[in-house]
Amino acid sequence: TPLGPKWPEPVFGRLASPGFPGEYANDQERRWTLTAPPGYRLRLYFTHFDLELSHLCEYDFVKLSSGAKVLATLCGQESTDTERAPGKDTFYSLGSSLDITFRSDYSNEKPFTGFEAFYAAEDIDECQVAPGEAPTCDHHCHNHLGGFYCSCRAGYVLHRNKRTCSALCSGQVFTQRSGELSSPEYPRPYPKLSSCTYSISLEEGFSVILDFVESFDVETHPETLCPYDFLKIQTDREEHGPFCGKTLPHRIETKSNTVTITFVTDESGDHTGWKIHYTSTAQPCPYPMAPPNGHVSPVQAKYILKDSFSIFCETGYELLQGHLPLKSFTAVCQKDGSWDRPMPACSIVDCGPPDDLPSGRVEYITGPGVTTYKAVIQYSCEETFYTMKVNDGKYVCEADGFWTSSKGEKSLPVCEPVCGLSARTTGGRIYGGQKAKPGDFPWQVLILGGTTAAGALLYDNWVLTAAHAVYEQKHDASALDIRMGTLKRLSPHYTQAWSEAVFIHEGYTHDAGFDNDIALIKLNNKVVINSNITPICLPRKEAESFMRTDDIGTASGWGLTQRGFLARNLMYVDIPIVDHQKCTAAYEKPPYPRGSVTANMLCAGLESGGKDSCRGDSGGALVFLDSETERWFVGGIVSWGSMNCGEAGQYGVYTKVINYIPWIENIISDF
């Protein structure tokens, strides 16, 4: 029997009946065995076929077989009801080998020319399967020359049989207090040859409850307990299962915080699997009872491990743990069924005793000593000498625990000294230097340092003076001895004040004229205002109308008198303002340099002389009465003048304060 070519030789060729294309002889039997490489099959087709036709091809025939299976028995020229001729059909081996047998019987009624066939090896597409046949691969099949391979979807791994996809279904850990888990692909059929392990791992103190839901379908056996596929549930206490079949297992209360679920499948079957809904429970904590004036949130039927509640107080009440305030309070239920902290109180907000108001007082409106939520107090300033600044003084204890004004301010009101009060009345007449009486010049300040000088009290902790009077002490403010509330220069009865800082106008140049001859002294403590110590007012914008030429101002001080000595008693003089040009001209003659009188100065005095301020008065205030407010204000600061005080044709020169209001305000607000 001739053999066809064997792999690895090229597998293709031609077969023909003996004597082809002539007629074939009787009693012939010829067999060809064709072998292709593994993963290939043989394809055969006929280009000529002419054999004796007989019933069921019993006489002459070509038989095609592959392994034990006969693929076709062929005869005749065309197919009939009971016989088959190849026609244009192509035949394929079932594996990699194909046997072809030709036989002719002892006679032919007429000559037959036999057959001619061609064959070739071709790749088998193992991925194509006939309807109803099991697929080659579980998931994805990939054909290639001489073979195929299988691959799996994400979440699966190829089994060692190279065809089945086993689920990668182990190592999943569920840590939430409730959840769902199911067999892979549920509710579609679960994968074969898989071993799945699921863990539920909750915090100690929880107990897992398992409920099988929807449907349950795991391959079973009528006699043996779950021999094929099974589901097992294991806790640290006991094992449940195995489970299989079609009946939903009952609820399992594990009494454990850890559960392992194992699901094993074999290589066969088509079942939908299972789904578990798990919940958890724990020892409940005592039901939280809200404190008076508070409420619990969230409200639950019960509170178990890890559950929490918060306490919220009504408006006007605050969370307190004893004396310690809390902005928020949350308690958490512990595994032993106790809360992790005790219930706080919702105590009525207490703003506490109101702060003392300097130079003022406070009155309890709601009731004596009542300082709790919505209580009202009234601040007021000491009458006559103090007035309340931008506030009505009414404060309410608000929910945040602060006394709050009607304007929403939490800071104390300010009792500002009333300025410009004087016991003196002026008739506007010019008269000689007079002794001051108590309360006439309560703003008068005596400054003792290297020399005697003066100043005027502003507010209750500033002194306005001349730069030249305190220049030497600008770096040693504490060297200034500041006295007020006295008329007698040498009296031991006075109010002592000390300087914290000296601010000399940056435009002042010492020993080079007196332009910008102005300074402020900040006191290290506020002074108490009374009839003998009262600040002078600063000029209003409209003040110029009270400081025109010939308007009367008053200068006061302990400076040199006509006798050439410092005055023992505070003296004052009423003097008119001098026309600025007239004053400028008076000081343009030698020995005075040109430009001695600047726009920052004003002059006052009599052309005839005799009324003037003098050495020792430096820094003191030249004051004017504002007839609209009936308050005295500082228009000038004693600065300089002729060598001989009160000289005819010469005038006292004063720093023009109205030019320096922004400078004064800036210093005071900044410091």
Epitope: G322, H323, L324, P325, L326, K327, R341, P342, D400, F402
Partner: antibody, heavy 115, light 107 residues
């Protein structure tokens, strides 16, 4: 992690004002709780000075109230202690601390009152 | 002010002993009491708050009890590292006050 750190001069002259600052990290002083100052004289027990709460309200030990001011700077997450007119009896280790539900203390700073 | 009186002022015990320190308040402080441990040269460390609640990280051998005026700190099995001074503190009312301290030593 919540941390508190005291800072300030270790030597203060009698009659002057003792000033200390506590810098808090890891927690905002406006979020909750009372932020306390506590002191411990050498070889003695602990004495509470006062606190400033999350809202800025203060509470002082009545025995020190006339001399104590506790304030805060929320932008720097700091709170401060000022104790005026100090004497040798104010020599101590000064701690800042948050008490009760949170319990964290600074390392303490030794302040000596001496001329 | 509420006085917090601790007893004993000092005590000596052996490793493994059960140790009890008491604290008596001069008036009712509810359960607003804390216990502190201070080792020499160290910062006080809170052990217990609200009379019986242990701070996280505090060994379970430390426990607190009491309410009103009488409070107890118990160390169930004394360890060498427990050598320290222990303070009770009330935070029920202003001023917050501490006990005078109990010095604990190992025999």
């Amino acid at each position: 992690e919540v941390q508190l750190q005291e800072s300030g001069p270790g030597l203060v002259k009698p009659s002057q004002t003792l000033s200390l600052t506590c810098t808090v990290s890891g927690y905002s002083i406006t979020s909750d709780y009372a932020w306390n100052w506590i002191r411990q004289p050498p070889g003695k027990g602990l004495e509470w000075i006062g606190y400033i709460s999350y809202s800025g309200r203060t509470s002082y030990n009545p025995s020190l109230k006339s001399r104590v001011t506790i304030s805060r700077d929320t932008s720097k997450n700091q709170f401060s202690l000022k104790l005026s007119s100090v004497t040798a009896a104010d020599t101590a280790v000064y701690y800042c601390a948050v008490l009760y539900a949170l319990d964290y203390w600074g390392q303490g700073t030794t302040v000596t009152v001496s001329s | 002010d509420i006085q917090m009186t601790q007893s004993p002022s000092s005590l000596s015990a052996s490793v493994g002993d059960r140790v009890t320190i008491t604290c008596k308040a001069s008036q009712n402080v509810d359960t607003n009491v804390a216990w502190y441990q201070q080792k020499p040269g160290k910062v006080p460390k809170a052990l217990i708050y609200s009379a019986s609640y242990r701070y996280s990280g505090v060994p379970s051998r430390f426990s607190g009890s009491g309410s009103g005026t009488d409070f107890t700190l118990t160390i169930s099995s004394l360890q060498p590292e427990d050598v320290a001074t222990y303070y009770c503190q009330q935070y029920n009312s202003n001023p917050l006050t501490f006990g005078q301290g109990t010095k604990l030593e190992i025999k």
